[in-house]
Interface confidence: low
């Protein structure tokens, strides 16, 4: 899993089924 912190504060994680259960992509938690 890749993690990154961008300049606008959200922590974004590339994962599957996190932001949407059936898809993989960047899920950002503010």
């Amino acid at each position: 899993r890749r993690r990154r912190r961008d300049t606008h504060f959200p922590i974004c994680i590339f994962c599957c089924g996190c932001c949407h259960r059936s898809k993989c992509g960047m899920c950002c938690k503010t």
Partner: antibody, heavy 118, light 110 residues
Framework: QIQLVQSGPELKKPGETVKISCKAS????????MSWVKQAPGKGLKWMGW????????TYADDFMGRFAFSLETSASTAYLQINNLKNEDTATYFC???????????WGQGTLVTVSA | DIVLTQSPASLAVSLGQRATISCRAS??????????MHWYQLKPGQPPKLLIY???NLESGIPARFSGSGSRTDFTLTINPVEADDVAIYYC????????FGGGTKLEIK
């Protein structure tokens, strides 16, 4: 640009079968799932389920298990909705729809009206 | 299944006034810091149009008269000021657990 183009209106009798097509363009077809949404006359929107365009695996909402089938022709970037043993209550406009990652549906077909009448 | 209840079922608003539509979910639609609630406008003979995504984000090309707010189970779509072209049915939709739509709210001009 992203487009979803559906097949034309259908007039069917009870007990018959209908198959609606939805041709996608402007994006990689297998990257996004395809949902189907029903709007019966004078009624609200009802999500019927979706098909994973990468694996071909369909998921059906509870009310649409049994007579309904989602399928794909990946080489033609086309999704299909088939309804078997048509009933009067299947009279509706059916939309194919492509969402974005968080599940918001930003792209819609124009809708296909299916009329079931003896 | 998550059930979405919209209120009111219909409302009539004078041109230039504010319209407020509520959507209540039977359980939270929040996950990973996101609210998986979206709003659509439906006009006769047209497909639905996405207005607001993830509770409060304005879709590209949609006028800033439309705004959304809320979290967990309670969400609001606001149109201010209302214009004649806004006559339509408005639906909320959740995508936290599969998808479901609310029952719709019909907006008319008083």
């Amino acid at each position: 640009q992203i487009q979803l183009v559906q097949s034309g209106p259908e007039l069917k009798k009870p007990g018959e079968t209908v198959k609606i097509s939805c041709k996608a363009s402007g994006y990689t077809f297998t990257t996004y799932g395809m949902s189907w949404v029903k709007q019966a006359p004078g009624k609200g929107l009802k999500w019927m389920g979706w098909i994973n365009t990468s694996s071909g695996v369909p998921t059906y909402a509870d009310d649409f298990m049994g007579r309904f089938a989602f399928s794909l022709e990946t080489s033609a970037s086309t999704a299909y909705l088939q309804i078997n043993n048509l009933k009067n209550e299947d009279t509706a406009t059916y939309f194919c729809a492509r969402d974005r990652y968080y599940g918001e549906v930003a792209y819609w077909g124009q809708g296909t009206l299916v009329t079931v009448s003896a | 299944d998550i059930v979405l209840t919209q209120s009111p079922a219909s409302l009539a608003v004078s041109l230039g006034q504010r319209a407020t539509i509520s959507c209540r979910a039977s359980e939270s639609v929040d996950s990973f810091g996101n609210s998986f609630m979206h709003w659509y406008q439906l006009k006769p003979g047209q497909p639905p149009k996405l207005l607001i995504y993830r509770a409060s984000n304005l879709e590209s090309g949609i006028p800033a008269r439309f705004s959304g707010s809320g979290s967990r189970t309670d969400f609001t779509l606001t149109i201010n000021p209302v214009e004649a072209d806004d006559v339509a049915i408005y639906y909320c939709q959740q995508s936290n657990e599969e998808y479901t739509f609310g029952g719709g709210t019909k907006l008319e001009i008083k």
